[in-house]
Amino acid sequence: DWVVAPISVPENGKGPFPQRLNQLKSNKDRDTKIFYSITGPGADSPPEGVFAVEKETGWLLLNKPLDREEIAKYELFGHAVSENGASVEDPMNISIIVTDQNDHKPKFTQDTFRGSVLEGVLPGTSVMQVTATDEDDAIYTYNGVVAYSIHSQEPKDPHDLMFTIHRSTGTISVISSGLDREKVPEYTLTIQATDMDGDGSTTTAVAVVEILDANDNAPMFDPQKYEAHVPENAVGHEVQRLTVTDLDAPNSPAWRATYLIMGGDDGDHFTITTHPESNQGILTTRKGLDFEAKNQHTLYVEVTNEAPFVLKLPTSTATIVVHVEDVNEAPVFVPPSKVVEVQEGIPTGEPVCVYTAEDPDKENQKISYRILRDPAGWLAMDPDSGQVTAVGTLDREDEQFVRNNIYEVMVLAMDNGSPPTTGTGTLLLTLIDVNDHGPVPEPRQITICNQSPVRQVLNITDKDLSPHTSPFQAQLTDDSDIYWTAEVNEEGDTVVLSLKKFLKQDTYDVHLSLSDHGNKEQLTVIRATVCDCHGHVETCPGPWKGG
């Protein structure tokens, strides 16, 4: 029959070539002379000439060694023709299977593999996976089946077998406990890949295992005891820098320190922060310390890390004895701002108040007083007693120096320390009103027509406070009442001036006396310009000229 079974040819055959593989034969050769040929890739198309056929005998020939890793199977067609070139058979499929030889070593996909694992993990923990490939066949043979193994480990601490590798997958895992980054931060494994499922050719690569840091070391104070000196009253003052050592990875959360004042800071006087570079604890004053109240503080500070400990660890504690140093403190006025009510216009030399300061220092220091700021120059202060007296006329209505009835004075106290220190106090004199101002009309100049004159309304003002103001009373004096009338309105805060007799055009003085509710009288001269006109006028018209 015109058929041929699949032909198996081992790769890398040593010849001699051409090598006879199989004979094509048509049973039509009994009737006529047959000529054989082959076509297909490997025969008449690339790669050409690998196979040939003896034209007359039908022997299939291999011309050169085969490489399975290049081409694993050839599919050719066999042809049979008669002498006249007529085809005597249908084209026949010829399959040539190249069988594998173990002619390739495994190859790792990288020369160096890198992986990492947390220190202190249990055995069984996966680290990384390595991969090797082998071009040989791994389906029908073991030629390309790779088995992985660890050849060596450096360093060999704490055991020479800290890791193992899955023989089939290449996954490296931890097999021994005792991974300690602080002792061995990195392991170098020489790994092997062997084909024939472990019985063939071997290749090696390197797997570097980085041991990652876990917070398995507590920060420790070094030293554990400190003595510091701090001047009293200093806020934000650096008291002491506390130093810790931590074996964990520098600048990691497992290394960075967190400080906590555990005891001794009853008044919440201190605070502690972590220096970002040195990791030191910087102890500073949050509030001023008072030597006179407590001259020594013993603080207990505990240190932990930003990251939680992965296991139970003893925490380190430092003791800091803070000695408070005495400083000459400024006298303090009591109260710092003193409000005193005093009548305006009191006689010169009259006492206003006593305003004194206390010295926080325990020594009996002498305090002297003086006025620091007295804008109007109205007061004097006894340097020894702190007695404030009037030396000028206190005027509530003085708008330059008095605001909202209050006259503000700054006083100074100085001790006799070395060097001397000063403190200031504020004296707020609330000036009580007296009826020292009479009512005043506004405006004091008017223009009025001498025919059908319009009544002139004048506002009345009084610098004093109620009850020394309205209702006001008006009276015309010096014969002004012959030509004029003055009447206060119902509210008592305006006066209406009217012309009651004809006056020729001119300027006249109207003598108006106003008195307030407290009968304080004020005489005011109103300048009245009388115009030749009717009704309302603002300025006198010019003389009339006929045409």
Epitope: G120, V121, T125, L161, T164, G178, D216
Partner: antibody, heavy 117, light 111 residues
Framework: EVQLLESGGGLVQPGGSLRLSCAAS????????MSWVRQAPGKGLEWVSA????????YYADSVKGRFTISRDNSKNTLYLQMNSLRAEDTAVYYC??????????WGQGTMVTVSS | QSALTQPASVSGSPGQSITISCTGT?????????VSWYQQHPGKAPKLILS???KRPSGVSNRFSGSKSGNTASLSISGLQAEDEADYYC???????????FGGGTKLTVL
């Protein structure tokens, strides 16, 4: 030579607690993972819990998770097993075992825990 | 149900040889050469007799030997003696949180 000595076993009522200790000597304790393995009467070995050398990693069998706590004090070369909410099925000999560098176990002599009312 | 499968019992006469098998998977016995065997006499603690498939600790008789093929490890005892009567357990390393698997145990009876 590795030596492991368990203590703390005894009779306890269901729901009660016990704390087992295992004193180790003869090896660098902190470099070895430690385990508790138990054996119920007439039964095989059952792995209960394990702890890494530093104490940073632990493992528990599902049957004891949430009830048992393994811990170690490397400064005292001692392994502990705190057993709470004990049940009748926790009755067994409890062995302390060290996981050596050859991936095998060295065993203590065991301590008996009986949970019964 | 144990992770590694052992026969429940084997027996042999004094002087004979016996083999106990321990079958796992390609992720434990088949993947690593970390199979150990332990001997346990009644009322006693287990004792290591083989580690890393076939390594005997000092003091263990050379009548005990181990081997592995594929996913199955074997413990062989030659020249059986009465004191060999005990329970035998195999263990294997595996990757994962349960890093060691136990066999169910095999009771060896010396007839």
């Amino acid at each position: 030579e590795v030596q492991l000595l368990e203590s703390g076993g005894g009779l306890v009522q269901p729901g009660g607690s016990l704390r087992l200790s295992c004193a180790a000597s003869g090896f660098t304790f902190s470099s070895y993972a430690m385990s508790w393995v138990r054996q119920a009467p007439g039964k095989g070995l059952e792995w209960v819990s394990a702890i890494s050398g530093s104490g940073g990693s632990t493992y528990y069998a599902d049957s004891v998770k949430g009830r048992f706590t393994i811990s170690r004090d490397n400064s005292k070369n001692t392994l502990y097993l705190q057993m709470n909410s004990l049940r009748a099925e926790d009755t067994a000999v409890y062995y302390c075992a060290s996981w050596g560098p050859t991936a095998s176990l060295d065993w203590g002599q065991g301590t008996m825990v009986t949970v019964s009312s | 149900q144990s992770a590694l499968t052992q026969p429940a019992s084997v027996s042999g006469s004094p002087g004979q040889s016996i083999t106990i098998s321990c079958t796992g998977t390609s992720n434990d016995v088949g993947a690593y050469n970390y199979v150990s065997w332990y001997q346990q006499h009644p009322g006693k603690a287990p004792k290591l007799i083989l580690s890393e498939v076939n390594k005997r600790p000092s003091g263990v008789s050379n009548r005990f030997s181990g081997s592995k093929s594929g996913n199955t490890a074997s413990l062989s005892i030659s020249g059986l003696q009465a004191e060999d009567e005990a329970d035998y357990y195999c263990t294997s390393y595996t990757m994962g949180s349960t890093f060691m698997l136990f066999g169910g145990g095999t009771k060896l009876t010396v007839l």
